[in-house]
Interface confidence: medium
């Protein structure tokens, strides 16, 4: 309970993109679905689908911010071959520019809110997961927030 | 040095359609998009829409959903854009210009315009 | 779609001294503590040119003459002080949201 209360702060406190987020179209879960086969299953903030398959909870808001952020970071770190400052801030100009503009919108709202810390994350050579994790876009495998 | 040249002036008739191009170069053209903006005699800017000239996608201001369309040949480096049905108001300078940031939306890099006058 | 106001449309100004460009949006244009507002230089006959940044980020290549400052709706482009290659015509544009927008203009002359 503790657990679920503390997941609708963090959501609250995350502002609201979901806004955008729950609009998305088939091609932004096929670009984000590439991304997540090990991924996913660690993540405790990726809900399942509500019976009626239309109802969206904070955590499944919060499990699509954490779809998206996997996907822009992957895709930053093949990107650049060697994680710096430069190369990574270089790269992060241009990360959101393949795919539809809806997936556009969607990773420039993202960037324009994380990029800072994404950059610092790779550059310290923390994994896609950990950088997600820490921007509080799901609870970290670990244990509880 | 970036540069983006765009076609020379134009003079066409009412009804009629006009493709205007933006070489660029000095840069991987592929890695920015291209903006169109629309400046009418004595008039502010107007913006047209973009396109991503690495996969051709493109995001356009409704206003001008139907009247521009913009398309980009990678082995040349250019961008164009196609207006159609021309009337009196299209009459106007149209620039094209780089968008140096992707997630940001300033234009960094201007062409130098391309005038199209629509008259009988 | 978000419109911008430029106030004053016109302004002379002695060299040397301050000008101050306002630029008011009708709707914030604020994203996660970024603002997405930009100033342009455009002189006759020639295409506009990128001055300011995401509000207050100078372009490279542009004198330290230049500034900007505000957020949420109201911002300002100061030249201080102005020179006689300044007089030009100043807009605002917002890239917060679609469709990106620009203010009507100040054209800046010199007394």
């Known amino acids: 309970m503790a657990t679920w209360a503390l997941l609708l702060l963090a959501a609250m406190l995350l502002g609201n993109p979901g806004l955008v987020f729950s609009r998305l179209s088939p091609e932004y879960y096929d670009l984000a679905r590439a991304h997540l086969r090990d991924e996913e299953k660690s993540c405790p903030c990726l809900a399942q689908e509500g019976p009626q398959g239309d109802l969206l909870t904070k955590t499944q808001e919060l499990g699509r911010d954490y779809r998206t952020c996997l996907t822009i970071v992957q895709k930053l770190k093949k990107m650049v071959d060697k994680p710096t400052q430069r190369s990574v801030s270089n790269a992060a100009t241009r990360v959101c520019r393949t795919g539809r503009s809806r997936w556009r919108d969607v990773c420039r709202n993202f960037m324009r809110r994380y990029q800072s810390r994404v950059t610092q994350g790779l550059v310290a050579g923390e994994t896609a997961q950990q950088i997600c994790e820490d921007l509080r876009l799901c609870i970290p495998s670990t244990g509880p927030l | 040095q970036v540069k983006l040249q765009e076609s020379g002036p134009d003079l066409v008739k009412p009804g009629a359609s006009v493709k205007i191009s933006c070489k660029a170069s000095g840069y991987t053209f592929t890695n920015y998009d291209i903006n169109w903006v629309k400046q009418r005699p004595g008039q502010g800017l107007e913006w047209i829409g973009w396109i991503d000239p690495g996969d051709g996608s493109t995001k356009y201001n409704e206003k001008f959903k139907g009247k521009a369309s913009l398309t980009a040949d990678k082995s040349s480096s250019t961008a164009y854009m196609l207006l159609n049905s021309l009337t009196s108001e299209d009459s106007a300078v149209y620039f094209c210009?780089?968008?140096?940031?992707?997630?940001?939306?300033?234009?960094?890099?201007w062409g130098q315009g391309t005038t199209v006058t629509v008259s009988s | 779609d978000i419109e911008l106001t430029q106030s004053p449309t016109s302004l002379a100004v002695s060299l040397g001294q301050r000008a101050t460009i306002s630029c008011r949006a009708s709707e914030s244009v604020d994203s996660y503590g970024d603002s997405f507002m930009y100033w342009y230089q455009q002189k006759p006959g020639q295409a506009p040119k990128l001055l300011i940044y995401?509000?207050?980020n100078l372009e490279s290549g542009i004198p330290a003459r230049f500034s900007g400052s505000g957020s949420r709706t109201d911002f300002t482009l100061t030249i201080n002080p102005v020179e006689a290659d300044d007089v030009a015509t100043y807009y605002c544009q917002q890239s917060n949201e679609y469709p990106y927008t620009f203010g009507g203009g100040t054209k800046l002359e010199i007394k």
């Open positions: 995401r509000t207050s």
């Open positions: 210009a780089r968008v140096g940031n992707d997630y940001d939306g300033g234009f960094d890099f």
